[in-house]
C-alpha cells in the first residue's frame, strides 16, 4: 500500500524518496513520474536524473535535498487539486528487475479559510499516528494520514520526511534505506 | 551567455532602506533558484537570501530575518532585495547567484554577478 | 548551527600541490562546492558536489570529501591560482547555504 502525503491547494508538496550510494558519487539514475509504478521506468515523467545531475525538469517540481548523495525527494510547488494521486519514485539499479519502486500517495485539500502562518518551522509529531512535518514553501503545513503498518522499504521514504527528528538520524544510522551495491 | 547585472548599492544611513536588483540573461530564469551573497570589506562570504523559480518560497539568513525580503519578477527576469532598518554590519559587496538546474534550493552558485558596493553609515 | 572550518592560509610552491581542507561534523554526508575569488572580482565555481568541474576549470583542480573533511586539491600550481578558496554546503536542517571562513592560497 501506498503511503498518503496531504498538502493544501497552494502549498508546496513534499515527496520523500532517498537510497545510499554505493561509494560517493556512485549514482544511479531515478525517475519521478505521476501515476504508479509500471514494470519498467516511470509514466508521465516529472524529473529524472542520470548518473551525474538533473537531465530533465518540468515546471513546479523539484528535487528538494541533496540528491548527489541519494536524497531524491520531490517539492511540488503551489499544488491544485489536479496534483491528487499517485507519484511513482523509482531507483533505477543497473541489472534486470533490480529497480527499487516506491508509490507515494499525495490527497491534495481544499485550501482553509483561516489563515495560516507564513512557514511552519517546527517539527512536531504525535507518534505513531499522526506527524506534521515541517514546511518547505509559504503557508505550508504538511500532514501524513494514519500510518498503515510500515516495512524497511516504507521506512525509506519516511526517514527523510523526518529527517530533522533525532529519529530520522537513527533510522539512517541503522541502515533503513536502500542501499546500493 | 549567462549573465548577472546587479544594480541599487551606494551610501544610506544607519535605519535607512536600499533595493538591490539583479538583471539576468542568457538562460531561462524561471527554473533556477537564485540568491544573494554578501561579502563584508577583507572579509568572507556570507550566504544572505534565496528564493526558488516560481518565487513561492524563501530562506533568509538570521542576521538579516525581518529586515531584508528578496524577490523576483520572472518576467522581466529579474531578482531583487529589499534592505530595510540597514546597520553599519551590512556594509559589503552584494552578489546575486544563480542555484543549480532542476533543485528547489539551488544548491550551489553556479554563476555570479559582479555585485553592488553597499555602504551604511553616517 | 553547523559549521565549516578552514585554514586561513595555505602556501605553496609553485609546480606543487595544493591541499585546502574543510571541515564539518560528518560532511561526507554533505555535497561540498569549493569557489575560488581573487582579489576586485567577484567568485567562480571551481568544484561541484565535491568532486565535478565545471567547464573552463582545469583538470589540476580536484576535490574529495569524507568522513568530516573536504578536501580541494590543486595539482601544479601556477602563480595564477593565487586567491581566496571557500567551501560551500546547504544546510538542509536550516535551509542555509553556508561558507567556510575561506583560504588564502599564496605562491611562493
Known amino acids: 500500500s501506498e503511503v498518503e502525503y496531504r498538502a493544501e491547494v497552494g502549498q508546496n508538496a513534499y515527496l520523500p524518496c532517498f537510497y545510499t550510494p554505493a561509494a560517493p558519487g556512485n549514482l544511479v539514475p531515478v525517475c519521478w513520474g505521476k501515476g504508479a509504478c509500471p514494470v519498467f521506468e516511470c509514466g508521465n515523467v516529472v524529473l529524472r536524473t542520470d548518473e551525474r545531475d538533473v537531465n530533465y525538469w518540468t515546471s513546479r517540481y523539484w528535487l528538494n535535498g541533496d540528491f548527489r548523495k541519494g536524497d531524491v525527494s520531490l517539492t511540488i510547488e503551489n499544488v491544485t487539486l489536479a496534483d491528487s494521486g499517485i507519484y511513482c519514485c523509482r531507483i533505477q539499479i543497473p541489472g534486470i528487475m533490480n529497480d527499487e519502486k516506491f508509490n507515494l500517495k499525495l490527497v491534495i485539500k481544499p485550501a482553509k479559510v483561516t489563515p495560516a502562518p507564513t512557514r511552519q518551522r517546527d517539527f512536531t509529531a504525535a507518534f505513531p499516528r499522526m506527524l506534521t512535518t515541517r514546511g518547505h514553501g509559504p503557508a505550508e503545513t504538511q500532514t501524513l494520514g494514519s500510518l498503515p503498518d510500515i516495512n524497511l522499504t516504507q521506512i525509506s521514504t519516511l526517514a527523510n520526511e523526518l529527517r530533522d527528528s533525532r529519529l530520522a538520524n537513527d533510522l539512517r544510522d541503522s541502515g533503513a534505506t536502500i542501499r546500493i551495491g | 551567455e549567462v549573465q548577472l547585472l546587479e544594480s541599487g548599492g551606494g551610501l544610506v544611513q544607519p535605519g535607512g532602506s536600499l533595493r538591490l536588483s539583479c538583471a539576468a540573461s542568457?538562460?531561462?530564469?524561471?527554473?533556477?533558484?537564485m540568491s544573494w551573497v554578501r561579502q563584508a570589506p577583507g572579509k568572507g562570504l556570507e550566504w544572505v537570501s534565496a528564493?526558488?523559480?516560481?518565487?513561492?518560497?524563501?530562506y533568509y539568513a538570521d542576521s538579516v530575518k525581518g529586515r531584508f525580503t528578496i524577490s523576483r519578477d520572472n518576467s522581466k527576469n529579474t531578482l531583487y532585495l529589499q534592505m530595510n532598518s540597514l546597520r553599519a554590519e551590512d556594509t559589503a559587496v552584494y552578489y546575486c547567484?544563480?542555484?543549480?538546474?532542476?533543485?528547489?534550493?539551488?544548491?550551489?552558485?553556479?554563476?555570479w554577478g559582479q555585485g553592488t558596493l553597499v555602504t551604511v553609515s553616517s | 548551527s553547523y559549521v565549516l572550518t578552514q585554514p586561513p592560509s595555505v602556501s605553496v610552491a609553485p609546480g606543487k600541490t595544493a591541499r585546502i581542507t574543510c571541515g564539518g561534523d560528518?560532511?561526507?554526508?554533505?555535497?561540498v562546492h569549493w569557489y575560488q575569488q581573487k582579489p576586485g572580482q567577484a567568485p567562480v565555481l571551481v568544484i561541484y558536489?565535491?568532486?565535478d568541474r565545471p567547464s573552463g576549470i582545469p583538470e589540476r583542480f580536484s576535490g574529495s570529501n569524507s568522513g568530516n573533511t573536504a578536501t580541494l586539491t590543486i595539482s601544479r600550481v601556477e602563480a595564477g591560482d593565487e586567491a581566496d578558496y571557500y567551501c560551500?554546503?546547504?544546510?538542509?536542517?536550516?535551509?542555509?547555504?553556508?561558507f567556510g571562513g575561506g583560504t588564502k592560497l599564496t605562491v611562493l
Open positions: 547567484a544563480r542555484g543549480s538546474y532542476g533543485t528547489y534550493y539551488g544548491n550551489y552558485f553556479e554563476y
Open positions: 542568457g538562460f531561462t530564469f524561471s527554473s533556477y533558484a
Open positions: 528564493i526558488s523559480g516560481s518565487g513561492g518560497s524563501t
Open positions: 560528518n560532511i561526507g554526508g554533505k555535497s
Open positions: 558536489y565535491d568532486s
Open positions: 560551500q554546503v546547504l544546510d538542509r536542517r536550516s535551509d542555509h547555504f553556508l
